[in-house]
């Protein structure tokens, strides 16, 4: 399974990524976050590691991405899962995996599901599996908006920079 | 399985495509290749066929789009395979199903893998069987930068222009 | 498959083409459509509740998104499909599921597919399932163009406002 | 300057056939759709569908479909609206418009009158 | 099809005035709503877009405003030259309708 990561020192050089400066002066937020693989039972996002940024006025609270202007936003993400059977046994009992993008903003009391994806697997059957869960779409958000995400099945996430992320980008 | 292409007079009008100018005269990159249909063993990419293009400096070489000014892309992709069982006895011969996008910069001397998808499949069990996988995230890239493509089970791909595509635009 | 990329010459002509004197320069038409949850057993595509919107020009035609200017847009669609077995003996009649976006412009006699995922799930083996599919890509369409979705396994749809959706935005 | 010039205009007889033409000049023919619109005497504004001159991409409003035909000539740099089956109730001023966005009429022709009558 | 319901169908105003015209959609359009303005002999032309975006050249006191099912067409302060019969559209779905027209008249 791919985990191929960058050394510290090549995600310092990425860290100083030459930004195209276009013709005109509008800026463009644009965030990509990667989940922290050294933490093995949560989903940490991280934005200060390999391919990962914050750019033009994106920031991270609480796990979550804070728009930074009111627009329109493709937000994004992926999640890949792995297990293998519990036992000869398991067949009767399904694992659920779902992910999901959440917007919480002053306007509701409430996480309000953006982007969902959900898959049902039986470790019994096939020992061992893969499976991958990508979605994406565009949204009207609010500047102080925040996307967070929410994952069933977080112990079998496969956690490197290429199968696990999350980011958004004004259109 | 999807495999429309376009007539011969129509494909004549559709070169001719329209391209939008905006108010503003900045270059906007973009391109969409599609896995060469004739090729099925193997995954070439091409963009001068359906709906398939480059623009705005993005070119192909080596298999691999060039990124034609530094900035932030997101880059994209898609695989649908296909496949039947190979034998009553084939259940415990998984088939491992990969596709990730990769980047080849002068600036590491390794394709480091920007997105990844997996699945196991087990063709005993389920006879025929068909998966798709696609994935996309925006990316800090510089103008010379390659992306490619590396795929596992190539054999099974279903190469039609609307199931195996790989594209980026700049942001 | 016929080719309808841009020739060398077509691309010159392309890159020559008048601006496009809009109301002001920072149009950008968007639009994100959620299948109708009240529609069971077939699949509408609404912009005027919940999360989905019509901007800058979008409008919907037939269940069609019509393309409000020319140029490159990128398109994309989920569904989530669930079910249960519908007896002990259903693992001989797969169940094919497929999601297509397709483009109807009135100089082809069909629709062109330019977006396609598809699986095959086996009732009896799993119960219950659930499978997400999600797809989207660059394409150069033109004004007036007709973007729209066509399914199987509709009754099998999880219509939510995060599960089920359809998209397109101008780059 | 974006012009549009409707003619063929005129009185026809009732389940008479008529062929409108729209002349476009100042911008590019094959970048926009062409709209045809018709108002009745003294009543609201009704639009009957477009056409797409670069790939003759055609929508139309469903009480036309089947009586009403848009095409266009790219050479002419001309639009046409074909209407057959004509009742008095057809009677109207028809516009051609050019849109920016496809569904906002931003430039119209001067219209062209058609009378159905006996 | 959608149908648009415009009140008042006509009004007499006076040079200065502030008027309003509404505009109530059959079906909720979100914010695909369009105003257009037409002299006698005229064609119409096109004011207001996405519900409130003003046209390229059209004066800043003609603003508009409203989502969902009602929109509002506003001339902060009426000029001469806008006396006129404006329409609503709504382009949300096709067929594209129009209301049946608001005259503005000289009191």
């Known amino acids: 399974l791919p985990g191929v990561g960058l050394t510290p020192s090549a995600a310092q050089t990425a860290r100083q990524h030459p930004k195209m400066h276009l013709a005109h002066s509008t800026l463009k937020p644009a965030a990509h976050l990667i989940g922290d693989p050294s933490k093995q039972n949560s989903l940490l996002w991280r934005a200060n590691t390999d391919r990962a940024f914050l750019q033009d006025g994106f920031s991270l609270s609480n796990n979550s991405l804070l728009v930074p202007t009111s627009g329109i936003y493709f937000v994004y993400s992926q999640v890949v899962f792995s297990g293998k059977a519990y036992s000869p046994k398991a067949t009767s009992s399904p694992l659920y995996l779902a992910h999901e993008v959440q917007l919480f903003s002053s306007q509701y009391p409430f996480h309000v599901p953006l982007l969902s994806s959900q898959k049902m697997v039986y470790p019994g059957l096939q020992e061992p599996w893969l499976h991958s869960m990508y979605h994406g779409a565009a949204f009207q958000l609010t500047q102080g908006d925040q996307l967070s995400t929410h994952t069933d099945g977080i112990p079998h996430l496969v956690l490197s920079p290429s199968t696990v992320f999350f980011g958004a980008f004004a259109l | 399985l999807p495999g429309v292409g376009l007539t011969p007079s129509a494909a004549q009008t559709a070169r001719q495509h329209p391209k939008m100018h905006l108010a503003h005269s900045t270059l906007k990159p973009a391109a969409h290749l599609i896995g060469d249909p004739s090729k099925q063993n193997s995954l070439l990419w091409r963009a001068n066929t359906d709906r398939a293009f480059l623009q705005d400096g993005f070119s192909l070489s080596n298999n691999s789009l060039l990124v034609p000014t530094s900035g932030i892309y997101f880059v994209y992709s898609q695989v649908v395979f296909s496949g039947k069982a190979y034998s009553p006895k084939a259940t415990s011969s998984p088939l491992y199903l990969a596709h990730e996008v990769q980047l080849f910069s002068s600036q590491y001397p390794f394709h480091v893998p920007l997105l990844s998808s997996q699945k196991m499949v087990y063709p005993g069990l389920q006879e025929p069987w068909l998966h798709s996988m696609y994935h996309g995230a925006a990316f800090q890239l510089t103008q010379g930068d390659q992306l490619s493509t590396h795929t596992d089970g190539i054999p099974h791909l279903v190469l039609s222009p609307s199931t195996v595509f790989f594209g980026a635009f700049a942001l | 498959l016929p080719g309808v990329g841009l020739t060398p010459s077509a691309a010159q002509t392309a890159r020559q083409h008048p601006k496009m004197h809009l109301a002001h320069s920072t149009l950008k038409p968007a639009a994100h459509l959620i299948g109708d949850p009240s529609k069971q057993n077939s699949l509408l595509w609404r912009a005027n509740t919940d999360r989905a919107f019509l901007q800058d020009g979008f409008s919907l035609s037939n269940n069609s998104l019509l393309v409000p200017t020319s140029g490159i847009y990128f398109v994309y669609s989920q569904v989530v499909f669930s079910g249960k077995a519908y007896s002990p003996k259903a693992t001989s009649s797969p169940l094919y599921l497929a999601h297509e976006v397709q483009l109807f412009s009135s100089q082809y006699p069909f629709h062109v597919p330019l977006l396609s995922s598809q699986k095959m799930v086996y009732p009896g083996l799993q119960e219950p399932w659930l499978h997400s599919m999600y797809h989207g890509a660059a394409f150069q369409l033109t004004q007036g163009d007709q973007l729209s979705t066509h399914t199987d396994g509709i009754p099998h749809l999880v219509l939510s406002p995060s599960t089920v959706f359809f998209g397109a935005f101008a780059l | 300057e974006v012009q549009l010039v409707e003619s063929g205009g005129g009185l026809v007889q009732p389940g008479g056939s008529l062929r409108l033409s729209c002349a476009a000049s100042g911008y590019t023919f094959t970048s926009y759709v062409i709209h045809w619109v018709r108002q009745a005497p003294g009543k609201g504004l009704e639009w009957v569908g477009y056409?797409?001159?670069?790939?003759?991409?055609?929508n139309y409003n469903e009480k036309f479909k089947g009586r009403a035909t848009i095409s266009s000539d790219k050479s002419k740099n001309t639009a046409y609206l074909q209407m057959n089956s004509l009742r008095a109730e057809d009677t109207a001023v028809y516009y051609c418009?050019?849109?920016?966005?496809?569904?906002?009429?931003?430039?119209w022709g001067q219209g062209t009158l058609v009378t159905v009558s006996s | 099809d959608i149908q648009m319901t415009q009140s008042p169908s006509s009004l007499s105003a006076s040079v200065g005035d502030r008027v309003t015209i509404t505009c109530r959609a059959s079906?909720?359009?979100?914010?695909?709503v369009a105003w257009y303005q037409q002299k006698p002999g005229k064609a119409p032309k096109l004011q207001i877009y996405?519900?409130?975006h003003r046209y390229t050249g059209v004066p800043s006191r003609f603003s508009g405003s409203g989502s969902g099912t009602d929109f509002t067409l506003t001339i902060s302060s009426l000029q001469p030259e806008d006396f006129a019969t404006y329409y609503c559209q709504e382009h949300y779905s096709t067929p594209w309708t129009f209301g049946q027209g608001t005259k503005v008249e000289i009191k």
């Open positions: 056409n797409n001159p670069y790939n003759d991409g055609t």
């Open positions: 418009s050019r849109p920016t966005m496809l569904p906002w009429f931003a430039y």
């Open positions: 079906q909720a359009v979100s914010s695909a």
């Open positions: 996405s519900a409130s």
